[in-house]
Every structure is written in structure tokens, then in C-alpha cells.
């Protein structure tokens, strides 16, 4: 979200000054070409300017940096490393800037960086060390508290010959750098599965958004260690049923609110436990909106209104009784 300061409080830099100044050490109150700056709000906006690289002459006071709607393509190592360092930079928004590669150490030398938004970039190549900065098995802790990675899946023809889920998870887990992460948004990424180790290594999570993916099952995912988790968004996935183990883990989390709208629930005999749970649990938000998608005879039935007699499975006939 953009800062509340009025546009008139931002000073704009004339484009023709850019080449003359970029080689010099930045002046304390200088504003990069094609950007708007407010020292009072500690904010720099370089928005929808088709920039192809991060400005070198960012003012040292910057706390909130918006580089959205550009054409950055690649974020190299030390993309924000400056002398003196951008020691105050706390919120960095790079959404919608056509990034397809983020290299190892891209966010190094940003000691105060708490919020990072890379949403709406087709990240075909996200280095495992993009957030940790090094390939050590245990890196220095990242200051990141909020990481927004919504809709970073590249078009299918641009994906590397590897699992996109695996690439993202490798970056989240490298060097255990993100142990302090409290908010993680991974919505709209076509995730088919959630690697089982990812949540166990992000113990500080308060908010996890996995909405609008293609998750079919949570059977191998454990939420048990996420004792601080406050919201879990699983809307608009491909979930068919939640099994007892998952129900028990969710029920036991002390702060949790779970969002399950718009999943294609399969209302057969395997749904009985979930329906029983839904009728009593208070952790599912808007549970009265959950409806069956399959089988056809159950479509649009409200889960809370089902009873055990409704939830049957067609018997599997022995081969000798099956008709051709």
C-alpha cells in the first residue's frame, strides 16, 4: 500500500540530471531520476517508470521504497548495497516489475528490511540464496518479518525443468535465515502440493496465505509446530477433504483462524470426520458457506447440513461381479 503523504510533499527529480549525478556519491537529500521522494515520510516511489535497474542514488533516509511496475528483469547480488548502506530501509515493494530472476544475495546489506513484496513477477529463477544471502548451512538471520510472494509463478513455457514449489521452498528454507518470518503470502502460484518440511522450519509464522493454488491434499503437511499461527488461508484450492490428523492439528493451534471457502469438497464416506468436526469447531471462518462439489448428487449441499446417512461411498464390486 502506498504511503499516506500527499503527492505534493514528494520532490521529483528531473530526468536530465540522472547521468550527471549517478557517478557521484549521492547527496543526502537527492532523489533519483524518475522517482518521487518524501524525506518527511522517508519514502521513495519509482512507480510505473519502466526502470530496467534499481537506481544507484537512493537517498540514505529511505525507509519505504516502491519500485513497482517497472522492467527490472534481473535482481543481481547486492542490488541494494550502497555506501553508506540503506540502513533504514524497512519496506521494499518490487511487485509487477517483470522480474524473472532474483540472484543470491539480492537483498544483502539491508539490515532493517522487514517487509518484502515480490508479487506479480514471473520468477523463473529464484536463487535458493535470494533471501539468506549465502550458501552456508546456517546463515545470519534475515530481518524479514513479512514476505509477499503472490502470483510469482512464471508461464509454463518459461519454467525451468524443475518443480516450482521446490524452487520457492528452497529459497524459504536456505540457511534457516527466515526463522523470524511472521507473514508469508504464497497465493496464486499454481502450487500442487506443499513440501512437508517447509512449515516446520518457519516456526514464527502468524499468517500464512496459500489461497488460489491447486492444493489437493494436506495429508503430508504438519501444522503442529506453528503454535503462533493466527490465520491460515486455503480458499480457492483443490482440496477434497481434510483428514483427522489435519483436523486435530488445526484444532489444537491456540490462535488459529482457518479459511476454507471455494474448495471442491467431495462429500462421500471419507468426509464424515470433517463434517463432524465442522459442526463443532469455531476455528473455521464462514463454515456455513462450505458446499459439496462432488459427487454430482451432492453438488451445492452445505457441509454443515449433512449427516452420516448422506455420506456414502459406492461399494467396490469384486471383479467377478463387475459388468463390462
Amino acid at each position: 500500500s502506498s504511503p499516506t503523504s500527499s503527492a505534493s510533499s514528494f520532490s521529483s527529480s528531473a530526468p536530465f540530471l540522472a547521468s550527471a549525478v549517478s557517478a557521484q556519491p549521492p547527496l543526502p537529500d537527492q532523489c533519483p531520476a524518475l522517482c518521487e521522494c518524501s524525506e518527511a515520510a522517508r519514502t521513495v516511489k519509482c512507480v510505473n517508470r519502466n526502470l530496467t535497474e534499481v537506481p544507484t542514488d537512493l537517498p540514505a533516509y529511505v525507509r519505504n521504497l516502491f519500485l513497482t511496475g517497472n522492467q527490472l528483469a534481473v535482481l543481481p547480488a547486492g542490488a541494494f548495497a550502497r555506501r553508506p548502506p540503506l540502513a533504514e530501509l524497512a519496506a521494499l515493494n518490487l511487485s509487477g516489475s517483470r522480474l524473472d530472476e532474483v540472484r543470491a544475495g539480492a537483498f544483502e546489506h539491508l539490515p532493517s528490511l522487514r517487509q518484502l513484496d515480490l508479487s506479480h513477477n514471473p520468477l523463473a529463477d529464484l536463487s535458493p540464496f535470494a533471501f539468506s544471502g549465502s550458501n552456508a548451512s546456517v546463515s545470519a538471520p534475515s530481518p524479514l518479518v513479512e514476505l509477499i510472494l503472490n502470483h510469482i509463478v512464471p508461464p509454463e513455457d518459461e519454467r525451468q525443468n524443475r518443480s516450482f514449489e521446490g524452487m520457492v521452498v528452497a529459497a524459504l528454507l536456505a540457511g534457516r535465515a527466515l526463522q523470524g518470518l511472521r507473514r508469508l503470502e504464497l497465493a496464486s502460484n499454481h502450487f500442487l502440493y506443499l513440501p512437508r518440511d517447509v512449515l516446520a522450519q518457519l516456526p514464527s509464522l502468524r499468517h500464512l496465505d496459500l489461497s488460489n493454488n491447486s492444493l489437493v491434499s494436506l495429508t503430508y503437511v504438519s501444522f503442529r509446530n506453528l503454535t503462533h499461527l493466527e490465520s491460515l488461508h486455503l480458499e480457492d484450492n483443490a482440496l477434497k477433504v481434510l483428514h483427522n490428523g489435519t483436523l486435530a492439528e488445526l484444532q489444537g493451534l491456540p490462535h488459529i483462524r482457518v479459511f476454507l471457502d471455494n474448495n471442491p469438497w467431495v462429500c462421500d464416506c471419507h468426509m464424515a470426520d470433517m463434517v463432524t468436526w465442522l459442526k463443532e469447531t469455531e476455528v473455521v471462518q464462514g463454515k456455513d458457506r462450505l458446499t459439496c462439489a462432488y459427487p454430482e448428487k451432492m453438488r451445492n449441499r452445505v457441509l454443515l447440513e449433512l449427516n452420516s446417512a448422506d455420506l456414502d461411498c459406492d461399494p467396490i464390486l469384486p471383479p467377478s461381479l463387475q459388468t463390462s
Epitope: E230, N244, L247, A248, Q251, G252, L253, P254, H255, I256, R257, F259, W277, E280, T281, E282, V283, Q285, G286, K287, D288
Partner: antibody, heavy 122, light 111 residues
């Protein structure tokens, strides 16, 4: 810092009405279930009821002893919780506490106000 | 309604010594693997404060001399070494079913 401050208590005659208020601060009010608990002088605690959060439609549950007489409501714009008490009886005399439920409401109340005294007497 | 029975009604304690309070439920307060049983302390002239939730989880900021145990219908609150500031009335509460109910309370006082 989470804070809950009750007000509106006082002396009321049997059959009368009273409206208690609870001003909440320090948390996202709409995310949480809120409740009223009362304590008659020298007695134990009695759950009066709760009101659910935004995600669960702000619906309410009341104890049998107050059903049809007491109504729990909330004004989310003001981060305030209310207890409208009608047809009051002598046995409703108590300190009334406003309390916030934990994020998972099954774990009950984690923050309580200081209480407001309601005395029903002629 | 689920009835909670606390014992003892009154518990005289010596500072530095351990203390234990029992709470028994008329039916199980377990739901999908968690016992939804809380313990509160109400100090004289104050509001109740949460000590233990989910039978055994110590609330943040509560001294680690407090612990909770039990499952299903039988629960115990233990204070490993009682301090003078621990005096007051202790209540158990179940939130497994509506209506939520409280035990009658146990008054802990210094001998």
C-alpha cells in the same frame, strides 16, 4: 497492549433494564470472539455468553439463565461490546466482566476487563 | 451442561512448598486431541487472569512454577513452590461445549 474497560453498571430495580459497555483497544477487534462473564458477590464465575467474530458472522450464544432477557452485541467501528439486560432479577446482581476470547476460541478467554457492578434491588 | 468439580474448596499453603488443585469434569472436555480446560487465578479485588490453557499450556508471562496436566475428565494444577503473591481463588473452566462452565473455585491462603 490489550485493554478492556467496562462501564454502565449501577443500581436498578427488579424488572428494569441496563446496558453495559466494554471499550476494547490494542487488538483487531473484528478478529475476536468477545464474551461476558459475571460473578455474584462472594460467589464463583458464571459464563453469560459470547459473540462471534467477523469471519463467523457476529452470531451469539447465551447461557440458559439469561436467554431471552440479555442480548450481546458489538459496534465494530467503535471497538465496543455491549450487554443489553432486560427483565432484571435480584439474582442478576453481580460484577460483570467483559473478556476477549483467544484467536482459537476453544481456548477461552485470555484478557479480562476490571468489571462493572450491577445491583438489582428495590 | 458440563459440571466441573474442584477440590479442595480451601487450601492453606506454606510459602516455598508445593500445592496441587484438582478439577474433575462430568464428561470429557477433549475435542480432536486437545482438552479444552483452562485455569484462572483471581487475586483479591482483581479480575481473573489466565494461567493455563488447553490443560497444560502455560500462558505467556505466567511464572513457570505453575503447570497443568490431565486429559479427558481429570485435571490438575500444580504450583511447584508457592509464593505469597499466589494467594487468591483458582478456577478451572471448560470451553469444550457451550455453555462454557467454571468450577466452584479453590481458595488458596497462606497458613
Amino acid at each position: 497492549e490489550v485493554q478492556l474497560v467496562e462501564s454502565g453498571g449501577g443500581l436498578v430495580q427488579p424488572g428494569g433494564s441496563l446496558r453495559l459497555s466494554c471499550a476494547a483497544s490494542g487488538f483487531t477487534f473484528t478478529d475476536y470472539y468477545m464474551s461476558w462473564v459475571r460473578q455474584a458477590p462472594g460467589k464463583g464465575l458464571e459464563w453469560v455468553g459470547f459473540i462471534r467474530n467477523k469471519g463467523n458472522g457476529y452470531t451469539t450464544e447465551n447461557s440458559a439463565s439469561v436467554k431471552g432477557r440479555f442480548t450481546i452485541s458489538r459496534d465494530n467501528a467503535k471497538s465496543s461490546l455491549y450487554l443489553q439486560m432486560n427483565s432484571l432479577r435480584a439474582e442478576d446482581t453481580a460484577v460483570y466482566y467483559c473478556a476477549r476470547y483467544r484467536g482459537n476460541p476453544h481456548y477461552a478467554m485470555d484478557y479480562w476487563g476490571q468489571g462493572t457492578l450491577v445491583t438489582v434491588s428495590s | 451442561d458440563i459440571v466441573l468439580t474442584q477440590s479442595p474448596l480451601s487450601l492453606p499453603v506454606t510459602p516455598g512448598e508445593p500445592a496441587s488443585i484438582s478439577c474433575r469434569a462430568s464428561e470429557s472436555v477433549e475435542f480432536y486431541g486437545t482438552s479444552f480446560l483452562q485455569w484462572y487465578l483471581q487475586k483479591p479485588g482483581q479480575s481473573p487472569q489466565l494461567l493455563i490453557y488447553g490443560a497444560s499450556n502455560v500462558e505467556s508471562g505466567v511464572p513457570d512454577r505453575f503447570s497443568g496436566s490431565g486429559s479427558g475428565t481429570d485435571f490438575t494444577l500444580k504450583i511447584s513452590r508457592v509464593e505469597a503473591e499466589d494467594i487468591g481463588v483458582y478456577f478451572c473452566q471448560q470451553s469444550r461445549k457451550v455453555p462454557s462452565t467454571f468450577g466452584g473455585g479453590t481458595k488458596v491462603e497462606i497458613k
